[in-house]
Interface confidence: medium
C-alpha cells in the first residue's frame, strides 16, 4: 500500500504519525514558514567527498549501553548548547563548528572553552565547501579547520568572540518576535577581521585542527569515536515527518524527501527497547526536544551512520 501524501506541516501528518504508535511523537515545530525555507534548512550535499578513515582499535574498548557527552564532560558548556542557523542552509557548517567547539574543550581539559564561529566557516570556506547558504559538504568543513583554522564566534548578536553569526534566528511560530523564516538570503561575505572591540586579531584568534577524518559506518566505530574524542558531525536524509519531531526515537514514517541535513551526534542510548543516537539540531531550542532529538541507531536509518566526520584539535 502506498503511503498517504500530506502537506509537510499539516495536522493530518501529525495525527498520522501519532496514530501509527511508532517510537516517536509528532507535534508542530513550525507554523508560519515557507516550504522553500524548510527545504533550505536541509543544506547538506550527501555523498560528497570523504576524507580517509582513521584507523581505530575498538575491540578492547568497553562501550556503555548509554552515553551522553553533556554528562561525560560537564565542564564543557558548548556540548549543551543549541544554535540556530536561521534562513540559511548552513547546517553543514553548524554541525562542524558545534562538534569542533566541543572537542577543543574536551581535548584541552576545559582550559580552552570557545564557541567556534559558524560565520567564519560558512563565509570563508568558499566553493571548496560547497555553496554557503545553499548547502555544503561536512567533510570539507573539517578539512578547512585543519588548513585555515576557525576563529571564535557565538550566536547572532551575542557579541561573543571574533565573528558571531550574522544571520538572525527566524520565527517558526505564528506569534513571535523574530523575523519570518524564508528560503531566501545570500551567504554573508567573508570578513577577515573581528567585530569591533574584540582582541586579539582575526589571524591570532584562529583555532586549528590537527587532522580530520571519516568515521566508518559501523555503529561501534561511531560510538567509540564519540566516547574517546567527543561529539561528531553526521548527516542524513530528512523527510517531512522529521520536521514534526517532538520526542521519542525518530524513524521515518511518511512524507516527502526534503534534502540532506547535517547535525552533531553527542551520545547514544536505548529507549523502550529502541536503540538511538542522541543528536543536537541547529533549528533553535523551540524545535524538537529543546533543540535535541533521538534517531534510530544501528540500521543506518536515513543514512545517519554513513556520513560521520570528525577531527582532532591542535592543542600545541
Amino acid at each position: 500500500r502506498s503511503r498517504p501524501s500530506f502537506h509537510p506541516l499539516s495536522d493530518e501528518l501529525v495525527n498520522y504519525v501519532n496514530k501509527r504508535n511508532t517510537t516517536w511523537q509528532a507535534g508542530h515545530n513550525f507554523y508560519n514558514v515557507d516550504m522553500s525555507y524548510l527545504k533550505r534548512l536541509c543544506g547538506t550535499f550527501l555523498g560528497g567527498p570523504k576524507p580517509p578513515q582513521r584507523v581505530m582499535f575498538t575491540e578492547d574498548l568497553k562501550l556503555p549501553a548509554s552515553f551522553d557527552a553533556r554528562e561525560q564532560w560537564p565542564q564543557c558548556p558548548t556540548i549543551k548548547e543549541i544554535r540556530d542557523q536561521g534562513s540559511c542552509g548552513s547546517c553543514w557548517a553548524f554541525g562542524a563548528v558545534e562538534a569542533i567547539s566541543d572537542r577543543i574543550c574536551i581535548h584541552t581539559n576545559a582550559h580552552v572553552s570557545v564557541e567556534v564561529s559558524a560565520e567564519d566557516l560558512l563565509t570563508c570556506c568558499g566553493s571548496m565547501c560547497g555553496d554557503g547558504c545553499n548547502g555544503g559538504y561536512p567533510a570539507e568543513a573539517w578539512n578547512f579547520w585543519t588548513r585555515k583554522g576557525l576563529v571564535s564566534g557565538g550566536l547572532y548578536e551575542s557579541h561573543v568572540g571574533c565573528r558571531p553569526y550574522s544571520i538572525p534566528p527566524c520565527e517558526h511560530h505564528v506569534n513571535g518576535s523574530r523575523p519570518p523564516c524564508t528560503g531566501e538570503g545570500d551567504t554573508p561575505k567573508c570578513s577577515k577581521i573581528c567585530e569591533p572591540g574584540y582582541s586579539p586579531t582575526y589571524k591570532q584568534d584562529k583555532h586549528y585542527g590537527y587532522n580530520s577524518y571519516s568515521v566508518s559506518n559501523s555503529e561501534k566505530d561511531i560510538m567509540a569515536e564519540i566516547y574517546k574524542n567527543g561529539p561528531v558531525e553526521g548527516a542524513f536524509s530528512v523527510y517531512s515527518d522529521f520536521l514534526l519531531y517532538k520526542s521519542g526515537v525518530y524513524q521515518h514514517v511518511t512524507g516527502e524527501m526534503m534534502g540532506g541535513h547535517a547535525i552533531r551526534i553527542l551520545g547514544w542510548g536505548v529507549e523502550n527497547g529502541t536503540p538511538y543516537w542522541l543528536v543536537a539540531n541547529s533549528w533553535n531550542t523551540d524545535w524538537g526536544d529543546n533543540g535535541f532529538f533521538k534517531i534510530l541507531r544501528g540500521q543506518d536509518h536515513c543514512g545517519i551512520e554513513s556520513e560521520v566526520v570528525a577531527g582532532i584539535p591542535r592543542t600545541d
Epitope: V112, V114, I193, S199, P200, K203, Y208
Partner: antibody
Framework: QVQLQQSGAELVRSGASIKLSCTAS????????MHWVKQRPEQGLEWIGW????????EYAPKFRGKATMTADTSSKTAYLQLSSLTSEDTAVYYC????????????WGQGTSVTVSS | DIVMTQTPLTLSVTIGQPASISCKSS???????????LNWLLQRPGQSPKRLIY???KLDSGVPDRFTGSGSGTDFTLKISRVEAEDLGVYYC?????????FGGGTKLEIK
C-alpha cells in the same frame, strides 16, 4: 632568505609628511600582519598599529590615529607607513615587524628607518 | 591602556650566572581562548628588536633553551639559566591581549 628591508634614513622639515617602506623577501606578506613600532632616542618601544596586507584592514593605537597611515601592496610585498604633520616628537627609529599568528608563529623585524625632524 | 612594568631597570650579571627579569601588567593577560599573549623581545646594541618568546612560554626558533618564559595573569618572568656574552642588550615584554598592544619600559642586561 627571509628578511624585511626598510627604506633609508630621512631628514625632514617640521610640518612635512614622509612615507617609509618595508619590503619583504622570502615569505608571503599576505600570511602576516605587518606591524609598525616607534622607538624614540634612548627610549622604549611604542606600538603604532598593524595592517593585514591580504585585505587592507588596519588597526591603530589611539595615540597614532591621524598621525600615521599604513598601506600595503601585496604585488611588491611592501608595507608603507606615512607620517604627517611632523614635529620633533616624531624624531625616532621606525621598525616594521611581520608577525604570523596561529600554530606556525613567526616574527621578523626590519632594520629600522631613522627619521629626524628639524625645525 | 595596559601598563607593563618591568623590573629591574638594569641587571648586571656575571657570565655563566642566572638572570631573571620581571614584568607586571595592570590587567590579566589571560585571554578567553586560554592563551596569554605575552612576548619577550631582546634588542642588542645598535640592532632591531628580536622576539625570543611568544604566548608566554614558547621559544622562537633558533632561541637557545637557556631562555624560559613563565607566569600567569598579571605576573611574568623571563629567566636565563646561564648568561652568555651575546645576551647583553635591552629586554622588553609586550602584551597583545588587550588593544592597543603595549611594551614594558625595558630591562638593560649588562655583563659584569
Amino acid at each position: 632568505q627571509v628578511q624585511l628591508q626598510q627604506s633609508g634614513a630621512e631628514l625632514v622639515r617640521s610640518g612635512a609628511s614622509i612615507k617609509l617602506s618595508c619590503t619583504a623577501s622570502g615569505f608571503n606578506i599576505k600570511d602576516y600582519y605587518m606591524h609598525w613600532v616607534k622607538q624614540r632616542p634612548e627610549q622604549g618601544l611604542e606600538w603604532i598599529g598593524w595592517i593585514d596586507p591580504e585585505n587592507g584592514d588596519t588597526e591603530y593605537a589611539p595615540k597614532f590615529r591621524g598621525k600615521a597611515t599604513m598601506t600595503a601592496d601585496t604585488s611588491s610585498k611592501t608595507a608603507y607607513l606615512q607620517l604627517s604633520s611632523l614635529t620633533s616628537e616624531d624624531t625616532a627609529v621606525y621598525y616594521c615587524n611581520a608577525r604570523r599568528h596561529g600554530y606556525y608563529e613567526m616574527d621578523y623585524w626590519g632594520q629600522g628607518t631613522s627619521v629626524t625632524v628639524s625645525s | 591602556d595596559i601598563v607593563m612594568t618591568q623590573t629591574p631597570l638594569t641587571l648586571s650579571v656575571t657570565i655563566g650566572q642566572p638572570a631573571s627579569i620581571s614584568c607586571k601588567s595592570s590587567q590579566s593577560l589571560l585571554y578567553s581562548n586560554g592563551k596569554t599573549y605575552l612576548n619577550w623581545l631582546l634588542q642588542r646594541p645598535g640592532q632591531s628588536p628580536k622576539r625570543l618568546i611568544y604566548l608566554l612560554s614558547k621559544l622562537d626558533s633558533g632561541v637557545p633553551d637557556r631562555f624560559t618564559g613563565s607566569g600567569s595573569g598579571t605576573d611574568f618572568t623571563l629567566k636565563i639559566s646561564r648568561v652568555e656574552a651575546e645576551d647583553l642588550g635591552v629586554y622588553y615584554c609586550v602584551q597583545g591581549t588587550h588593544f592597543p598592544y603595549t611594551f614594558g619600559g625595558g630591562t638593560k642586561l649588562e655583563i659584569k
